[in-house]
Amino acid sequence: LGCDLPQNHGLLSRNTLVLLHQMRRISPFLCLKDRRDFRFPQEMVKGSQLQKAHVMSVLHEMLQQIFSLFHTERSSAAWNMTLLDQLHTGLHQQLQHLETCLLQVVGEGESAGAISSPALTLRRYFQGIRVYLKEKKYSDCAWEVVRMEIMKSLFLSTNMQERLRSKDRDLGSS
């Protein structure tokens, strides 16, 4: 990718997914009735015409929002602190790296629209998640539903990153 998002960024993303999986505290089978349609903006991560700025912006905003969501008093009360600390550290590292990349991509003249538009969409999506948690009084099941939702959206975003990486490889080898 622009600053050549290295292999270790993909590794960090997968590590975040592993941590989110390990954070599970109750059986999701107990929480079926708490499911909610958060309307993850799939169109943002499914396109075939992927711009570097767009991909980085989506990843950056996703990680920033996940960091914020899991960096609250409510979150600290809900999750294992050791795993939560590891999650914070991993997200912080990824965010630092993405910020460096985004500066470089903007310096290369990629459209600012490709950066601001996904950010706004994702903020709305995460706001819906926050409203849901409040509505459900931050219950164990509500957090479990949110944990699964974040895993799904992060998985889709990481896939988008992998697609761009393989597109770059194809261009490089042709």
Epitope: H21, R24, S27, P28, F29, C31, L32, K33, D34, R35, R36, D37, F38, E144, V145, M148, E149, K152, F155
Partner: antibody, heavy 121, light 107 residues
Amino acid sequence: EVQLVQSGAEVKKPGESLKISCKGSGYSFTSYWIGWVRQMPGKGLEWMGIIDPSDSDTRYSPSFQGQVTISADKSISTAYLQWSSLKASDTAMYYCARHPGLNWAPDFDYWGQGTLVTVSS
Amino acid sequence: DIQMTQSPSSLSASVGDRVTITCRASQSISSFLNWYQQKPGKAPKLLIYYASSLQSGVPSRFSGSGSGTDFTLTISSLQPEDFATYYCQQSYDLPITFGQGTKVEIK
């Protein structure tokens, strides 16, 4: 293309053991739960139980608790349904189907083709 | 356990007819209700999920409605390939339960 492929038909005697399988492909196997459904000859659908292949957490219908065991091997994207001692009343078609777990997506959107189990002396 | 009761248990209809099948839950299940179609010797096929969402690839003549305890599956204009058995199923809570089925036969 998402597929759930089940093992072939089985003919067994009462008291014998059996393990049938359901192999998932074309999707992230650990992102969905796998449910098992029984259909006795000429009858309706009965939910038996469900497994989360990511960590093998399992829940059974009270009617099937202790009668069958559901398991999964995520390394080969396969779920299993097994009996330690079959009865004639276990004669039925058994289906596996995938479930999105807590994610907002269609329930049981893909089904295996079914495994016919016949138990007769 | 949540009991699911379908009615009628069978019905005879002609091609082009409007067909309605109802499903009642023994307690409120919000909109966690799915409808399946099953043809002899085949696996069930998902038609409607979350009470009213049409599954991808399913013809628009199928529709679902309802919430709470009372639900309906409607086939607006019955086609020859629609003669089958239809099941409702709740996924509001475990154990997951199915209705007993409604067989739609040719008049």
